[in-house]
């Protein structure tokens, strides 16, 4: 070995070095914190650049850039110094226009306090390992919640469009006439039936054990979804959303409540079936697989 | 498709009487009202009468105590009798109903309408 490469070696491996660029990150960190940093830090800013450097080219003396088994570019971790080195050499040399898209990736310097605390590295380590054992899992949970839309489609397409709208009708009106003058929200709730303080118009349903409207007003399908257009099961991709919002449990019993007041109370077992199957089993079934991987990692 | 068609309509003679039907057909969820039209020639349409799905009955000012609406809701079918008929009451009688269908939202739907004719 020659003595550059000897010198490189027993930098890297003391535990000052790790401690200085640990040190560094985290100063790095809380300079990127500050809203409206002043001049100065422009300087510092230089100062955490010549650092990385410094320490990625002690790691390549030591270890070689990249030919043979062990040499800096064949570890995934230092893929990262290379790329921060690299960004923060660009945005500051060479002029590319607008470079506050290629600033965002300083944020990626964080990123290097994962590869300089052991124990973080294990975490990661064990998720990047968990994402390659989900894989399967990923695709049992799609192909579940594609079906599960799929009949949630057939069942419900429709439905969350239907509203209570005022029977007493002028003369000449016609619900196309009014809907044409519809243009505030105002507007809407002189035709439609809104509960207090609803964003939305009551939905109901055309089924005995669905939802009925109050006397003097009639069920119609017309008008848009519920919460602003965003929960319906009218194409396969809302009804998608629809049942990864079951499946996570993210404000379920609304979109329960609002379905089986549209569609009727028997399709409840709809909603037990895919709440046991997805929320409780598929879900249980991700946190086993992730356990497992961090354990393996920890072994 | 959703389809009105009408029947009933012809020829009679004042103070005579004529019932006319209409009924829909197609993919029908939900029939919210059916309504009957008097279209007469360079004159807009006028309501003659309109039976809404909780069976009330709205009827036009110059057939009150005249017309009578009722409905068969098995059928989707509505029945227009009309008694004392008068000149006035000529015109081609459109069948109009506001209908959910199986496929697309709450829409009214016409009929192409039946001629009625009062003249001695």
């Known amino acids: 070995f020659s003595p550059l490469r000897r010198i490189s070696i027993k930098i890297l491996v003391h535990s000052l070095f790790s401690m200085l660029i640990m040190c560094t990150i985290l100063t790095n960190c809380i300079f990127m914190t500050m809203n409206n940093p002043p001049d100065w830090t422009k300087n510092v800013e230089y100062t955490f650049t010549g650092i990385y450097t410094f320490e990625s080219l002690v790691k390549i003396l030591a270890r070689g850039f990249c030919v043979g088994e062990f040499t800096f570019l064949r570890d995934p971790w230092n893929w990262l110094d290379f790329v921060v080195i690299v960004f923060a050499y660009l945005t500051e040399f060479v002029n590319l226009g607008n470079v506050s898209a290629l600033r965002t990736f300083r944020v990626l310097r964080a990123l290097k306090t994962i590869s300089v605390i052991p124990g973080l590295k294990t975490i990661v380590g064990a998720l990047i390992q968990s994402v390659k054992k989900l894989s399967d899992v990923m695709i049992l949970t799609v192909f579940c919640l594609s079906v599960f839309a799929l009949i949630g489609l057939q069942l419900f397409m429709g439905n969350l469009k239907h509203k209570c709208f005022r029977n007493s009708l002028e003369n000449n009106e016609t619900l196309e006439s009014i809907m044409n003058t519809l243009e505030s929200e105002e507007d809407f709730r002189k035709y439609f039936y809104y509960l207090e303080g609803s964003k939305d118009a009551l939905l109901c349903g055309f089924s005995t054990d669905s939802g009925q409207c109050p006397e003097g007003y009639t069920c119609v399908k017309i008008g848009r979804n519920p919460d602003y257009g965003y929960t319906s099961f009218d194409t396969f991709s809302w009804a998608f959303l629809a049942l990864f919002r079951l499946m996570t449990q993210d404000y379920w019993e609304n979109l329960y409540q609002q379905t089986l007041r549209a569609a009727g109370k028997t399709y409840m077992i709809f909603f037990v079936v895919v709440i046991f199957l997805g929320s409780f089993y598929l879900i249980n079934l991700i946190l086993a697989v992730v356990a497992m991987a961090y354990e393996e990692q920890n072994q | 498709e959703v389809q009105l068609v009408e029947s009933g309509g012809g020829l009679v003679q004042p103070g005579g009487s004529l019932r006319l039907s209409c009924v829909a057909s197609?993919?029908?969820?939900?029939?919210?009202?059916i309504a009957w039209y008097r279209q007469t020639p360079g004159k807009q349409r006028d309501l003659v009468a309109r039976?809404?799905?909780?069976?009330?009955?709205k009827y036009g000012d110059s057939v009150k105590g005249r017309f009578a609406m009722s409905r068969d809701k098995v059928k989707n079918m509505v029945h227009l009798q009309m008694n004392s008929l008068t000149t006035e009451d000529t015109g081609v009688y459109v069948c109009?109903?506001?209908?959910?269908?199986?496929?697309?939202?709450?829409?009214?739907?016409w009929g192409r309408g039946t001629l009625v004719t009062v003249s001695s």
């Open positions: 109009s109903a506001l209908i959910t269908p199986w496929t697309g939202d709450t829409r009214t739907y």
């Open positions: 197609g993919g029908i969820i939900n029939i919210n009202y």
């Open positions: 039976i809404s799905s909780d069976d009330t009955i």
